[in-house]
């Protein structure tokens, strides 16, 4: 296999040499078969190669590793453990690699791993200890700062009996390992709800992306602990209204920007507090674009243009007056 070039261009390994190389100890900084390597950029790209496992002979210098568009299926414990360890690996992208199982300790022995992208993998089985590495009640802190888990929901027929939200949250909270996490992306996962304890245990979060899910309500979610949250993406959900408690919490976060586009806002009497808040707040990005979806008579009305007289609820008739 050809040695890595020290120029910024990528050197490729000849695939037909792979079997010969794997029969002997790997050379210190060789480039794995089917990959492209740049020592100058500290980057290895093994992209769209239908790899079924993580190459064993990754160069020790690798800082950015792209393993996207493969067919990895399972990420076992210690999938990146090497001797000597991949001490420089800071960014790992495994998106779109047909992973359906990530086992406990899959990312162990990566002391510098700051950024992990598992997006676009149908993760039917994400171990609770995938990120913490152990089942201790308090694990060693993970170095992860950015965790990208967009569109990791498997097809419905491949989901296990437990709730998908619960499986993901268990992995996020195990051993309190992700206390230093600053960016968490969970877009496009069909989340119906956000378990109430998840945010309280991720105090360092600066960016939280929950866009394109199916969240109907935030009533039981508390953002109070996310003291330095900067962006909260809630676009393209099923939110009907934000209640006073949520509004007050968001207003109390001094660095936040909230993104609320494309939700089916219900413009009835329960919307009055939110409309008042929207008129006063600066934290909502593009607030002038928010429109009513229901009731029918209010459809496409701009929330900021509503007043209290517009926001009524149909009186509930006592049972004796209800018609069958």
């Amino acid at each position: 296999s050809s040695p890595t070039s020290s120029a910024s261009s990528f050197s490729s390994s000849a695939p037909f040499l792979a079997s010969a190389v794997s029969a002997q100890p790997p050379l210190p900084d060789q480039c794995p078969a089917l990959c492209e390597c740049s020592e100058a950029a500290r980057t290895v790209k093994c992209v769209n190669r239908n790899l079924t496992e993580v190459p064993t002979d990754l160069p020790a210098y690798v800082r950015n590793l792209f393993l996207t568009g493969n067919q990895l299926a399972v990420l076992p414990a210690g999938a990146f453990a090497r001797r000597p360890p991949l001490a420089e690996l800071a960014a790992l992208n495994l998106s779109g690699s047909r992973l359906d199982e990530v086992r406990a300790g899959a990312f162990e022995h990566l002391p510098s791993l700051r950024q992990l992208d598992l997006s676009h993998n149908p993760l039917a089985d994400l171990s609770p200890f995938a990120f913490s590495g152990s089942n201790a009640s308090v694990s060693a802190p993970s170095p992860l700062v950015e965790l990208i888990l967009n569109h990791i929901v498997p097809p419905e027929d491949e989901r296990q009996n437990r709730s998908f939200e619960g499986m993901v949250v268990a992995a996020l909270l195990a051993g309190r390992a992700l206390q230093g996490l600053r960016r968490l992306e969970l877009a496009s996962n069909h989340f119906l709800y956000l378990p109430r304890d998840v945010l309280a245990q991720l105090p360092s979060l600066r960016h939280l992306d929950l866009s394109n899910n199916s969240l109907v309500s935030l009533t039981y979610v508390s953002f109070r602990n996310l003291t330095h949250l900067e962006s909260l993406h809630l676009e393209d959900n099923a939110l009907k209204v934000l209640h006073n408690g949520t509004l007050a919490e968001l207003q109390g976060l001094p660095h936040i920007r909230v993104f609320l586009d494309n939700n089916p806002w219900v413009c009835d009497c329960h919307m009055a507090d939110m409309v008042t808040w929207l008129k006063e707040t600066e934290v909502v990005q593009g607030k002038d674009r928010l429109t009513c979806a229901y009731p029918e008579k209010m459809r496409n009305r701009v929330l900021l243009e509503l007043n209290s007289a517009d926001l009524d609820c149909d009186p509930i008739l006592p049972p004796s007056l209800q018609t069958s």
Epitope: A91, E146, R182, R183, R206, H228, E230, P254, R257
Partner: antibody, heavy 115, light 107 residues
């Protein structure tokens, strides 16, 4: 770690306008907020304003509103602070600082206003 | 605007000493209180945010406490490299405001 590199020192006449730049590089996890802070010679720190780089939303200290304009170019990860109608009391070092809690600071740009 | 009053304005201490600086806000700022270090000709550094959270890479001899309007910054054992000016700053209510600074010198 985030590196913030600011443009060089400027000498301006009263009434003129100065535009300082601040380029962010290095760490991938920099904040969306970029703040600007003034430090007059021998004095303390004074917050001018900030910009949320992704959508251009700004907040200003009322003392500078109308004279300070903060902008950002996301394609080059560069923020700018323009100060108009300069007067002698604007002579100071101006810092950019990245983060809600101003986690990382630039080296400062000295602006001297003198006729 | 919220006024931040820092004391003392200057302070002389010996290597190994425990040093404390106070900061008082003119109104409640919850825990949104940060501490910065400025050395001549160097970039300003964030040491502590949200009253007591240590910024990454900051030595554990630095700590902070308080809540509401009264806050304290402590260096448990002064080191020669700690000679600098220290500022408190509130980021609870716009506009953000700084204390006047405390210049720390070695005896």
């Amino acid at each position: 770690e985030v590196q913030l590199v600011q443009s060089g020192a400027e000498v301006k006449k009263p009434g003129a306008t100065v535009k300082i730049s601040c380029k962010a590089s290095g760490y991938a996890f920099s904040s969306s907020w970029m703040n600007w802070v003034k430090q007059a010679p021998g004095k303390g720190l004074e917050w001018i304003g900030r910009i949320y780089r992704e959508d251009g939303h700004t907040n200003y200290n009322g003392k500078f509103k109308g004279r300070a304009t903060i902008t950002a170019d996301t394609s080059t990860t560069t923020a700018y602070m323009e100060l108009s109608s300069l007067r002698s009391e604007d002579s100071a070092v101006y810092f950019c600082a990245n983060g809600g809690a101003m986690d990382y600071w630039g080296q400062g740009t000295l602006v001297t206003v003198s006729s | 605007d919220i006024q931040m009053t820092q004391s003392p304005s200057s302070l002389s201490a010996s290597v190994g000493d425990r040093v404390t600086i106070s900061c008082r806000a003119s109104q409640d700022i919850s825990n949104y209180l940060n501490w910065y270090q400025q050395k001549p000709g160097k970039a300003v550094k964030l040491l502590i945010y949200y009253t007591s959270r240590l910024h990454s890479g900051v030595p554990s001899r630095f700590s902070g406490s308080g809540s509401g309007t009264d806050f304290t910054f402590t260096i448990s054992s002064l080191q020669p490299e700690d000679i600098a000016t220290y500022f408190c700053q509130q980021d609870n209510t716009l506009p953000w405001t700084f204390g006047g600074g405390t210049k720390l010198e070695i005896k």
